[in-house]
């Protein structure tokens, strides 16, 4: 569907004749009939198959015709047509004299006809003018026309309709060529499907307007690219909806079983070593002078075992007394009133006199120590173990059991947790934030499953005499760590006391 | 705004166990901070540190008492309970429970409830 | 373990006047871990003061600590009716935790 307009520009008749050569009296008082026809080779008169139209009266003899499109009149002349525009024409213009108002054809004499123009040739649609001029002996006719398609219509030959809209069945405009120009934040064949909003992810998300992004079941986030984790978890992640993957250090259903309490929460105080001993449990191994579950509290004086030689510690307002057993004597109980004829020397240590025979010193071998050679010799007590190792005795010498991620005789290097496969007996290795933790298979325990929890040398209390038993790691084996007075690897002889004396 | 609530029996014939409960409103007794305490008043006497309990299960008891103390704590009830053996006429006393959070201060006390062993 | 020995016993004041309460410690109380509470008849005690002079949020600014190592002071600027009762002082620093043995404060 379109429209082939025709613009009347000028029309010369300076001597104001008819056709036939007679002259209009008073003048030619012209109008203009249009026919509009399919292409003809020799035009011929026939049906107007594209359409006709007349004009009204528009000047007498030579004129100017005025544009009159803007004020709603004729010119250029519209020749609608509801057709594919074939791209080829037939036009028939003539000028007409009126001597009356009546217009019609049946109503003017036959030799009213002023003059005849006829063309044909090719025109393609669109919005440029064609200027032409056709002369005949009396008159001259300037004009131009075109083809442009009715609203809705496009395409070179107004065949495509399209119809602009912004609604349920489509967001679009239309291109000079009737193709759809979806409107911004549309796309589709019909501009019906909006754009998310940009970065939204392709399956999780989705939108009903542009620029949005509304989530499917199970993601989250502004662009729909994050999991929802199962309802509940506490210290996890997901990759994929509902699931619940611990952070380390966090196990359980949901991810709230506290695995490393000690790297969570800090809770030991005054230089205290933590443990984790199990889900949401800890130990603090204290520093001397210090206790309280969190180490938070100091010693009172007797509790750190200040008393030697036996001696016994009373708690007292101002502090604490030491109540000495016979034969010592001083603020710990650190001085002896035997001599060395009284052989106070354990465990083959050797005596020495010291002030003229007043006091003795004993000499002792080693592994042994004490002012009576009556402690074996704790290696330990000088915490050689480096980052939180723990010191085991071994005889004569002692050795460190490092904490995960450390090594070398005193734990002194840092080794890179899990690296080494540090877990024994098949443990499996988890990397903590401070170090790592071992998972150790049934029958096995300690920090890197090398604990045999189904032996424990010390479960039989081998030692006699109150004795203090202590497993063997290695060997599976116990020692004994005899009380005053006691000797043998079990702590079952006495040793020979020194007779006592009358004072 | 927390709340602590004693309850147990307000009498306790000698030798036997005196059994107190406390129970924890308006807090979660999984407070990593808290220290959860039983503190005891005798009559017209001053106050006496029984001992305390951690959500973890961690405990430290005054070495006074500790022979004869049991304290233990149900985080699925959010309470803590004391038990003392081996009751005497001695133990007759007002038992508070208490919590303190960090630092030994008591910020926040049950009302109290007075046990009387007697036979 | 530590004692505290409270002293006066009893101090009788009149509202508005100016108290001071003593806590003497048997040993040093190491970095100043020691409370004051105000206890009332019929009632638990009240948190006043922590770390010897620090003020628990929603006490009267009339009520402040001092003090050090074994000597300890609880002040009162100006009495206020509701503020005679029984006071505690209490170590924190050491086990097992104690406290003094009161000081009461009634009307004059």
């Known amino acids: 569907s379109g429209v082939f307009q025709l613009q009347l520009q000028e029309f010369i008749n300076e001597r104001g004749v008819l056709a036939s050569g007679r002259p209009c009296e008073p003048g030619c008082r012209t109008f203009f009939r249009v026919c509009l026809k399919h292409f003809q080779a020799v035009v011929s008169p026939g049906p107007c198959t594209f359409g006709t139209v007349s004009t009204p009266v528009l000047g007498t003899n030579s004129f100017a015709v005025r544009d009159d499109s803007s004020g709603g009149g004729r010119n250029p002349l519209q020749l609608p047509f509801n057709f594919t525009w074939p791209g080829t024409f037939s036009l028939i213009i003539e000028a007409w004299h009126a001597p009356g108002d009546d217009l019609r054809p049946e109503a003017l004499p036959p030799d009213a006809l002023i003059s005849k123009i006829a063309i044909q040739g090719s025109l393609a649609v669109g919005q440029n003018w064609l200027l032409d001029e056709q002369t005949s002996t009396l008159t001259r006719l300037r004009y131009s026309y075109r083809v442009i398609c009715s609203d809705n219509y496009y395409g070179d030959n107004c065949s495509r309709l399209c119809k602009k809209r912004n609604d349920h069945f489509g967001h679009y405009v239309c291109q000079p060529d009737g193709n759809l120009s979806c409107l911004p934040g549309w796309t589709g064949e019909y501009c019906q499907q909006p754009i998310c909003l940009s970065g939204c992810h392709e399956q999780n998300g989705y939108c009903s307007k542009p620029a949005e992004c509304l989530c499917r079941p199970g993601w989250q986030g502004r662009l729909c690219n994050e999991c929802i984790p199962h309802n509940g978890c506490r210290h996890g992640t997901c990759s994929t909806p509902w699931q619940c993957t611990c952070d380390e250090g966090w196990g359980g259903l949901f991810c709230d079983q506290d695995l490393n309490y000690c790297t969570h929460h800090s809770p030991c105080k005054n230089g205290a070593t933590c443990s984790n001993s199990g889900q949401r449990s800890y130990t603090c191994t204290c520093r001397p002078g210090y206790t309280g579950v969190d180490c938070e509290l100091e010693l009172s004086e007797c509790d750190s075992n200040p008393c030697r030689n036996g001696g016994s510690c009373k708690d007292q307002e101002d502090g604490y007394h030491c109540l000495c057993p016979p034969g010592y004597y001083g603020l710990h109980c650190e001085h002896s009133t035997l001599s060395c004829a009284d052989s106070p020397c354990f465990n083959g240590g050797s005596c020495r006199e010291r002030n003229q025979g007043a006091n003795y010193a004993c000499e002792c071998p080693p592994n042994f120590t004490g002012s009576n050679c009556e402690k074996k010799v704790d290696r330990c007590t000088s915490n050689p173990c480096a980052n939180g190792g723990q010191c085991l005795n071994r005889g004569p010498s002692r050795m460190c059991r490092c904490r995960p991620g450390f090594t070398g005789t005193y734990c002194e290097l840092h080794v890179s947790d899990c690296a080494r496969n540090p877990c024994a007996h098949g443990g499996t290795c988890h990397d903590l934030e401070n170090g790592l933790m071992c998972t150790c298979p049934a029958g096995f325990s300690g920090r890197r499953c090398e604990v045999r929890t189904s032996i424990d040398a010390c479960a039989s209390s081998p030692c006699f005499n109150r004795a203090t038993c202590y497993t063997d790691l290695s060997t599976d084996t116990f020692v004994c760590n005899c009380p005053y007075g006691f000797v043998g690897s079990r702590c079952e002889f006495p040793v020979g006391l020194p007779p006592s004396f009358p004072w | 705004q927390v709340q602590l609530q004693e309850s147990g029996p307000g009498l306790v014939k000698p030798s036997q166990t005196l059994s107190l409960t406390c129970t924890v409103s308006?807090?979660?007794?999984?407070?990593?901070?808290?220290?959860w305490t039983w503190i005891r008043q005798h009559p017209g006497k001053g106050l006496e540190w029984i001992g305390y309990i951690k959500y973890t299960g961690g405990i430290h008891y005054n070495p006074s008492l500790k022979s004869r103390l049991a304290i233990s704590v149900d985080t699925s009830k959010n309470q803590f309970s004391l038990k003392m053996n081996s009751v005497t006429a001695a133990d007759t006393a007002k038992y508070y429970c208490?919590?303190?959070?960090?630092?030994?201060?008591?910020?926040?006390w049950g009302q109290g409830t007075t046990v009387t062993v007697s036979s | 373990a530590i004692r505290l020995t409270q002293s006066p016993g009893t101090l009788s004041w009149s509202p508005g006047e100016r108290a001071t309460l003593s806590c003497r410690a048997s040993q040093s109380v190491s970095s100043n871990y020691l409370a004051w509470y105000q206890q009332k008849p019929g009632q638990a005690p009240r948190l006043l003061i922590y770390g010897a002079s620090s003020r628990v949020a929603g006490i009267p600014d009339r009520f402040s600590g001092s003090g050090s190592g074994t000597d300890f002071t609880l002040t009162i600027s100006r009495l206020e009716p509701e503020d005679f009762a029984l006071y505690y002082c209490q170590q924190y620093s050491r086990s097992p935790i104690t406290f003094g043995q009161g000081t009461k404060l009634e009307i004059k």
């Open positions: 308006d807090d979660s007794i999984n407070n990593v901070e808290s220290y």
């Open positions: 208490a919590r303190a959070r960090g630092s030994h201060t008591f910020d926040v």
